[in-house]
Interface confidence: low
């Protein structure tokens, strides 16, 4: 800190006074000095440190007509709203020639009613859920004792006897108000009143009850809602997208969700008009007269696949002796899911039909029993997804193989020795 020298008489003719008051007080500190020649700039120190951003003004009045005559300089430091950080020792400092001069100190102190550093805040809490409220106050004068009040009723017999900075509330079943009183030698200060709104608990166990290609039925268990009955629950569904990063704690979906309201009870809702074989994320919140619960985490769900909407295309069935070669192409109609394979049914005029699961191949060779004398053999093919069969093709009669026709080589699938189905199948 700068040090004044006493080699010459101090120029200060006035030093800062003392200010003691309550928070928020406005006050002014002044220094006055008389110097010969050009007046210097006055700096303010607090506890020995220069205040760079002090709210100060300086006035200079010459005592004579000559520039070299004496000047009276007054510097004023304004403290606009007294805070604890303003307290300390204040001095003025000037540089004159090669010397530094410091005024005598003044003191700024704080004393009065307690001051709240932290007050209870309005908040929402889930019913029957523990939470904490904070309150912090200081003097001077110390000590400061706190008294908590719930709905204007003290929670302790006397200040300082109950919880102090933190009040633990084990849970509420109705919306309540909390405040805090701070007591010191100068008196009592009351904090703001915080309203703690009791909302329903987050629903639990959001789960699928049933799935269909274009609808999902979901159910959940409602949380407690205190004395306030639930009025409705809101379900949101959003199309999942690998790149969208829905996380358990993410507050908002990345796109506009599909929102549905369910009157309660029952705590169940059927979501319709969905896409088949499509991943969604869903969440639910329930509302009482006090407001909505928090959302559940996003639950990934998926509509099941639908069946293909059309039969396989371009089916051809060719016979060559005791073998029949059948091939086809994927349906042009939407598959509504992942194609898992094809089923083929064939039947002769006087023989039971046979149903085969071909897998994903698009051709099959049937090894016919006997000498190939089965007459009027017809073949039907259907594509299937996880949801089941699509429509079967119209029966395709076997054509006799003509020389020159290509016939790919592939695995033979033999007909069971005892055919086993009623025709038509489905």
């Amino acid at each position: 800190a700068p040090r004044g020298t006493q080699a010459e008489e101090s120029p200060f003719v006035g030093n800062p006074g003392n200010i003691t008051g309550a928070r928020g007080l406005t006050g002014t500190l002044r220094c006055q000095l008389q110097v010969q020649g050009e007046p210097p700039e006055v700096h303010w120190l607090r506890d020995g440190q220069i205040l760079e951003l002090a709210d100060s003004t300086q006035t200079q009045v010459p005592l004579g007509e000559d520039e070299q005559d004496d000047w009276i300089v007054v510097s004023q430091l304004r403290i606009t709203s007294l805070q604890l950080s303003d307290t300390g020792q204040y001095q003025c400092l000037v540089f004159l020639g090669h010397q530094t001069f410091v005024s005598q100190p003044g003191y700024v102190g704080l004393e009065g009613l307690p001051y709240f550093l932290e007050e209870p805040e309005d908040r929402t809490v889930a019913a029957n859920t523990p939470f904490n409220l904070s309150c912090q106050a200081q003097g001077p004068p110390e000590p400061v004792d706190l008294l908590w009040l719930q709905d204007a009723v003290p929670l302790a017999t006397a200040p300082g006897h109950g919880p102090q900075r933190s009040l633990h509330v084990p849970g509420l079943n109705k919306t309540s108000s909390f405040s805090c009183e701070a007591h010191n030698a100068k008196g009592v200060t009351t904090s703001r009143t915080a309203t703690i709104t009791v909302l329903p608990q987050q629903p639990r166990n959001l789960h699928l009850v049933s799935r269909q290609p274009t609808e999902l039925e979901v159910a959940w268990t409602p949380g407690l809602s205190g004395i306030y009955p639930l009025t409705h629950c809101t379900l949101q569904a959003v199309l999942s997208d690998d790149g969208m990063g829905i996380q358990a704690g993410e507050p908002d979906p990345p796109e506009e969700p599909l929102t549905s309201q369910a009157s309660v009870p029952p705590h169940q809702l059927r979501l319709g008009s969905l896409h088949p074989h499509t991943p969604y994320h869903i969440r639910v919140a329930c509302t009482s007269s006090q407001g909505p619960s928090s959302w559940t985490h996003w639950l990934p769900v998926e509509t099941p696949e639908g069946v293909p909407l059309g039969p396989p295309e371009n089916i051809s069935a060719t016979r060559n002796g005791s073998q029949a070669f059948v091939h086809w192409q994927e349906p042009r109609a939407p598959l509504q899911g992942t194609l898992l394979g094809y089923r083929l049914a064939y039947q002769g005029q006087d023989t039971p039909e046979v149903l085969m699961d071909i897998g994903l191949r698009q051709e099959v060779t049937l090894e016919l029993q006997g000498d190939g004398s089965v007459s009027n053999l017809t073949v039907c093919v259907a594509a299937y997804t996880a949801a089941g069969d699509g429509p079967w093709s119209l029966p395709v009669p076997l054509e006799a193989w003509r020389p020159g026709q290509a016939q790919p080589v592939h695995q033979l699938v033999k007909e069971p020795s005892t055919p086993a189905f009623s025709w038509p199948w489905w």
């Epitope: 049933s210 799935r211 269909q212 290609p213 099941p304 069946v307 898992l340 046979v354 149903l355 085969m356 699961d357 897998g359 299937y384 996880a386 949801a387 089941g388 069969d389 695995q411 033979l412 699938v413 033999k414 069971p416 005892t418 086993a420 189905f421 009623s422 038509p424 199948w425 489905w426």
Partner: antibody, heavy 120, light 107 residues
Framework: EVQLVQSGAEVKKPGATVKISCKVS????????MNWIRQPPGKGLEWIGL????????SYNQKFKGRVTISADKSISTAYLQWSSLKASDTAMYYC?????????????WGQGTLVTVSS | DIQMTQSPSSLSASVGDRVTITCKAS??????VAWYQQKPGQAPRLLIY???TRHTGVPSRFSGSGSGTEFTLTISSLQPDDFATYYC?????????FGQGTKVEIK
């Protein structure tokens, strides 16, 4: 949770008819097939037939055709197996089983079984 | 009909043993074979389908292999809960047929 709940045990005289039921829950009844399988006491499994509840299409094991009728009631998600002209050799545990979505013919969920006893 | 022949019809083994059950189809069934486990008084439970695909919730000690006409179910380390009867079944075409079963007993 997928559940298949079958009707209770039956005792029948030879020549009689029995009808047993299989009520399903936990999945879309009409989107899958229901198989029926039987197992005589101390013996292996024997496939009887299946139904696609969405349209009532059926397939039967030729061995039992004519004596067996498989049906379904979509409105109550229930499949039925009716067996006529019962013989003592038809004494068995009868199971319904849900066809796996990747192959109708592999059975992923089974009922608890219905014991049918044929005795004079 | 396709016949499915299982072997052995029964076997005795100890906890921790590696157990192999085979199943032969009378004709090529591609890879359309399922394996089931059945305990006394209970319905069968699907273990494997399409020869080697484990059904949901089936422990990894169960594995299946094979194609064409020869198929195998392997239990890599037999557990007390695994003593049961095992059936193979072709799921290629109807009528569906099962093997006669393999009973795995405690040695």
């Amino acid at each position: 949770e997928v559940q298949l709940v079958q009707s209770g045990a039956e005792v029948k005289k030879p020549g009689a008819t029995v009808k047993i039921s299989c009520k399903v829950s936990g999945y879309s009844f009409t989107g899958h097939t229901m198989n029926w399988i039987r197992q005589p006491p101390g013996k292996g499994l024997e496939w009887i037939g299946l139904i696609k509840p969405s349209n009532g299409g059926t397939s039967y094991n030729q061995k039992f055709k004519g004596r067996v009728t498989i049906s379904a009631d979509k409105s109550i998600s229930t499949a039925y197996l009716q067996w006529s002209s019962l013989k003592a050799s038809d004494t068995a545990m009868y199971y319904c089983a849900h066809g796996h979505y990747e192959s109708y013919f592999a059975m992923d969920y089974w009922g608890q079984g219905t014991l049918v006893t044929v005795s004079s | 009909d396709i016949q499915m022949t299982q072997s052995p019809s029964s076997l005795s083994a100890s906890v921790g043993d590696r157990v192999t059950i085979t199943c032969k189809a009378s004709q090529d069934v591609s890879s359309a074979v399922a394996w089931y486990q059945q305990k006394p008084g209970q319905a069968p439970r699907l273990l494997i389908y399409w020869a080697s695909t484990r059904h949901t919730g089936v422990p990894s000690r169960f594995s299946g292999s094979g194609s064409g006409t020869e198929f195998t179910l392997t239990i890599s380390s037999l557990q007390p809960d695994d003593f049961a009867t095992y059936y193979c079944q072709e799921h290629n075409s109807t009528p569906l047929t099962f093997g006669q079963g393999t009973k795995v007993e405690i040695k």
